[in-house]
């Protein structure tokens, strides 16, 4: 029950996280103009990964996709790539985890297969979350660097006088959405990996036996030892009771002297 809950919760948390990563990637407010110490408030500018927007003091806003013959900054392209990789991995992880859910029955899928799928989706969620966090952090780092460069430039002019007001840009809402979403996806992935341990069958009995309709005689399997999956070791080589079954070693296909008593 706890395993199913952990797996289900991991799935839901990851689902929310991936939805957040998609939302952050599509949002326009990755960098927003810092209005502090800026006397010109006629136009407010903010940028996303895909579009640049300007908002008038009247509230009128216009956005256009990046259109440049000189090419976009390499770092922006890198952030785009990280976010897209995060979304793709997350989406595949979600697809895999749906089939891995313990509460969903698909044909005669074994628990070991579900455990493997749960682990796979968990790893995918972890990598997806890390990609999103990395992408957002790289972008944030660029903004911090630019912010302090702009601040330094603001106060370096002829004889210490301010010549032109340099616009500074600060963190947009998308960065916070991205960080939280990446974190949730990461947590969801960890939960799926934990659930995988509980899903894996503890013990499997491997018996190579042939059954015969022979009286009421009871035989014990001479070497029937428990096979371990790796999650629980079988230190005591316990015998396994086999009802009326005989192992291949015990089956005698030729007549013996006891048959004619």
């Amino acid at each position: 029950m706890a395993v199913t809950a952990c797996q289900g919760l991991g799935f839901v948390v990851s689902l929310i996280g991936i939805a957040g990563i998609i939302a952050a990637t599509c949002m326009d407010q990755w960098s927003t103009q810092d209005l502090y110490n800026n006397p010109v408030t006629a136009v407010f500018n903010y940028q996303g990964l895909w579009r640049s927007c300007v908002r008038e003091s009247s509230g009128f806003t216009e956005c256009r996709g990046y259109f440049t013959l000189l090419g976009l900054p390499a770092m922006l392209q890198a952030v785009r790539a990280l976010m897209i990789v995060g979304i793709v991995l997350g989406a595949i992880g979600l697809l895999v985890s749906i089939f891995a859910l313990k509460c969903i029955r698909i044909g005669s899928m074994e628990d070991s297969a579900k455990a493997n799928m749960t682990l796979t989706s968990g790893i995918m969620f972890i990598v997806s979350g890390l990609c999103a966090i990395a992408g957002v952090s790289v972008f944030a780092n660029m903004l911090v660097t630019n912010f302090w460069m702009s601040t330094a430039n603001m106060y370096t002019g002829m004889g210490g006088m301010v010549q032109t007001v340099q616009t500074r840009y600060t963190f947009g809402a998308a960065l916070f959405v991205g960080w939280v979403a990446g974190g949730l996806t990461l947590i969801g992935g960890v939960m799926m990996c934990i659930a995988c341990r509980g899903l894996a069958p503890e013990e499997t009995n491997y018996k190579a036996v042939s059954y015969h309709a022979s009286g009421h005689s009871v035989a014990y399997k001479p070497g029937g030892f428990k096979a371990s999956t790796g999650f629980g070791s079988n230190t005591k080589n316990k015998k396994i009771y086999d009802g009326g079954a005989r192992t291949e070693d015990e089956v005698q296909s030729y007549p013996s002297k006891h048959d004619y008593v």
Epitope: S31, Q33, V43, N45, Q47, S52, V54, R64, G65, Y66, F67, T68, L69, L70, G71, L72, P73, A74, M75, L76, V79, F139, M142, L143, T145, N146, T164, Q166, T167, Y169
Partner: nanobody, 122 residues
Framework: QVKLEESGGGLVQAGGSLTLSCAAS????????MAWYRQAPGKQRELVAR???????TYADSMKGRFAISRDTAKNTVYLQMNSLKPEDTAVYYC????????????????WGQGTQVTVSS
């Protein structure tokens, strides 16, 4: 950063025409949007017209039909053709550029020129 320099302002009779120009210090291909704003004494700075990198334009309602924004990519210059000028068009006209410096990192900017005075006498 992108430095902007306006020119073409001056005194003009009502009903007359004037062309303002704004020269950018870097290729305007790297600029997302260039715009003209104006500020009359005691009033807030308002949008006149803007031209985006893809060539699309936007005009303030009161200037539609009278004003036209254009650009010359070879000269890295944006123009504002003003026709049928009225005394209420008297203001300081500012050039604005918004974009990203593509030097590897993501360095956005929103820069203004010093402004050029346009006076329309009746």
């Amino acid at each position: 950063q992108v430095k902007l320099e306006e020119s073409g302002g001056g005194l003009v009779q009502a009903g007359g025409s004037l062309t303002l120009s704004c020269a950018a210090s870097r290729s305007i291909f790297s600029i997302d949007v260039m715009a003209w704003y104006r500020q009359a004494p005691g009033k807030q700075r308002e949008l006149v017209a803007r031209i985006w990198a893809d060539g699309s334009t936007t005009y303030a309602d009161s200037m539609k039909g009278r004003f036209a924004i254009s650009r010359d990519t070879a000269k890295n210059t944006v123009y504002l053709q003003m026709n049928s000028l009225k005394p209420e068009d008297t203001a300081v006209y500012y050039c604005n550029a918004v974009g990203t410096i593509a030097d590897g990192a993501f360095r956005p900017y929103n820069n203004w020129g010093q402004g050029t005075q346009v006076t329309v006498s009746s």
